[in-house]
């Protein structure tokens, strides 16, 4: 029962995590205009992996996609790739784990096969979570670097009274969604791997020995000795592994040229 619970919980946590990774990837608020230096702006800029947006004080929001591949920074392309790989691996992992769930019976699938599938999906979730965390972290690092670069160049090119204040960007909501989602997917993957150990049959069935006593026909069947054989037939011993994770499910999106320099 505990293995089923661990596996089920791992699946649910991973499902929430992957949904979060998808949400983060689609969100426009990966970087948002830093208002510390200009809190009185009537125009608010924010950028995602796929487009950049401007929200005016009237509430009017205008978004423009990055209609170029070659013109975009290599780091942005790398982040896109990491997030997409994370989503693809996660989606495949989810598909595999559905069939691996102990509570779902598909034909005469043996527990050994389910254990293998659980392990496979667990590894996929772990890699998926790591991809998301890596992607978000690379983007965050890029923001930090550019933030300090633009701070250093804040008022360069001033001619007399005229100031050209460079727009600085800071962490957007998508980064936090991505980090949390990646972490959840990772935790879900670990739980699936733990559940796999419990699913693996650990019982060796020795052939029953018949003792024929005189005048009686009684068969004695000794119970099989527990042995750690890896994958065999049905297992009766299960270990309890409990894990829990809190999810942050708030994803918001509001209401050009990509400005990284």
């Amino acid at each position: 029962m505990a293995v089923t619970a661990c596996q089920g919980l791992g699946f649910v946590v991973s499902l929430i995590g992957i949904a979060g990774i998808i949400a983060a990837t689609c969100m426009d608020q990966w970087s948002t205009q830093d208002l510390y230096n200009n809190p009185v702006t009537a125009v608010f800029n924010y950028q995602g992996l796929w487009r950049s947006c401007v929200r005016e004080s009237s509430g009017f929001t205008e978004c423009r996609g990055y209609f170029t591949l070659l013109g975009l920074p290599a780091m942005l392309q790398a982040v896109r790739a990491l997030m997409i790989v994370g989503i693809v691996l996660g989606a495949i992992g989810l598909l595999v784990s559905i069939f691996a769930l102990k509570c779902i019976r598909i034909g005469s699938m043996e527990d050994s096969a389910k254990a293998n599938m659980t392990l496979t999906s667990g590894i996929m979730f772990i890699v998926s979570g790591l991809c998301a965390i890596a992607g978000v972290s690379v983007f965050a690092n890029m923001l930090v670097t550019n933030f300090w670069m633009s701070t250093a160049n804040m008022y360069t090119g001033m001619g007399g009274m005229v100031q050209t204040v460079q727009t600085r960007y800071t962490f957007g909501a998508a980064l936090f969604v991505g980090w949390v989602a990646g972490g959840l997917t990772l935790i879900g993957g670990v739980m699936m791997c733990i559940a796999c150990r419990g699913l693996a049959p650990e019982e060796t069935n020795y052939k029953a020995v018949s003792y024929h006593a005189s005048g009686h026909s009684v068969a004695y069947k000794p119970g099989g000795f527990k042995a750690s054989t890896g994958f065999g037939s049905n297992t009766k011993n299960k270990k309890i592994y409990d894990g829990g994770a809190r999810t942050e499910d708030e994803v918001q999106s509001y209401p050009s040229k990509h400005d990284y320099v």
């Epitope: 205009q33 200009n38 009185v40 702006t41 009537a42 125009v43 800029n45 924010y46 950028q47 950049s52 947006c53 401007v54 005016e56 004080s57 009237s58 509430g59 009017f60 205008e62 423009r64 005229v162 100031q163 050209t164 204040v165 460079q166 727009t167 050009s256 040229k257 400005d259």
Partner: antibody
């Protein structure tokens, strides 16, 4: 058609308060921010602040902070601008102006103006 | 606060001639996010409220005659009336729409020569 109708002229003594109203019609009242701009006789335009009728959010020009209060009444589609501790230099025509939705933060419709005279 | 400076303070142009009004801001009104300039031009006739002519530095408001043209970017902007008509006699104001407090130029009075 969009119309912004303001209250009539007022004469006030220094230190008193004045409350100017602006009744909106011809559009969804809560969908557009309302600005207040004043113009002293023979002078230029001066932005005072705005109110968002949707959520009652306000932003005031630092110059008027503590003296100006903008409110709204959604039931009558009316915004109000109250200026307290009046001084002679507050004598001006006060305009309410609607912030256009797609006009890059520009004000597309203006009220006819309310003349406030501060005199002892 | 962003300071808006208009030139000239007053301008006299013959009917049918071109009128040009300049506006300079102390900070750039160009938004990097969408490469748009947040500057508006208003026309105010005596005893009337201002009327929006141009927004986004160059976009003509609906109903505004095409003889009115806005141009410029960053800190320097221009309002051009290609062929002055009698009804164009008014005071013209430029306005910063980029940062609060919204600020106006001191105005340019346009008259017929």
């Amino acid at each position: 058609q969009v119309q912004l109708v303001q209250s009539g002229a007022e004469v006030k003594k220094p230190g008193a308060s004045v409350k100017v109203s602006c009744k909106a019609s011809g559009y969804t009242f809560t969908s557009y921010i309302m600005h207040w701009v004043r113009q002293a006789p023979g002078q230029g335009l001066e932005w005072m602040g705005y109110i968002n009728p949707y959520n009652d959010g306000t932003k005031y020009n630092e110059k008027f902070k503590g003296r100006v209060t903008m409110t709204r009444d959604t039931s009558t589609s009316t915004v109000y601008m109250e200026l307290s501790s009046l001084r002679s230099e507050d004598t001006a025509v006060y305009y309410c102006a609607r912030l256009g939705f797609t006009t890059r933060n520009a004000m597309d419709y203006w009220g006819q103006g309310t003349l406030v005279t501060v005199s002892s | 606060d962003i300071v808006m400076t208009q030139s000239p303070d007053s301008l006299a142009v013959s009917l049918g001639e071109r009128a040009t009004i300049n506006c300079k801001s102390s900070q750039s009104l160009l938004n990097s996010g969408n490469q748009k300039n947040y500057l508006a031009w208003y026309q105010q006739k005596p005893g009337q409220p201002p009327k929006l002519l141009i927004y986004g530095a160059s976009t003509r408001e609906s109903g505004v005659p095409d003889r009115f043209t806005g141009s410029g970017s960053g800190t320097d902007f221009t309002l051009t009336i290609s062929s002055l008509q009698a009804e164009d006699v008014a005071v013209y104001y430029c306005q910063n729409d980029h940062s609060y407090p919204f600020t106006f130029g001191q105005g340019t009075k346009l008259e017929i020569k």
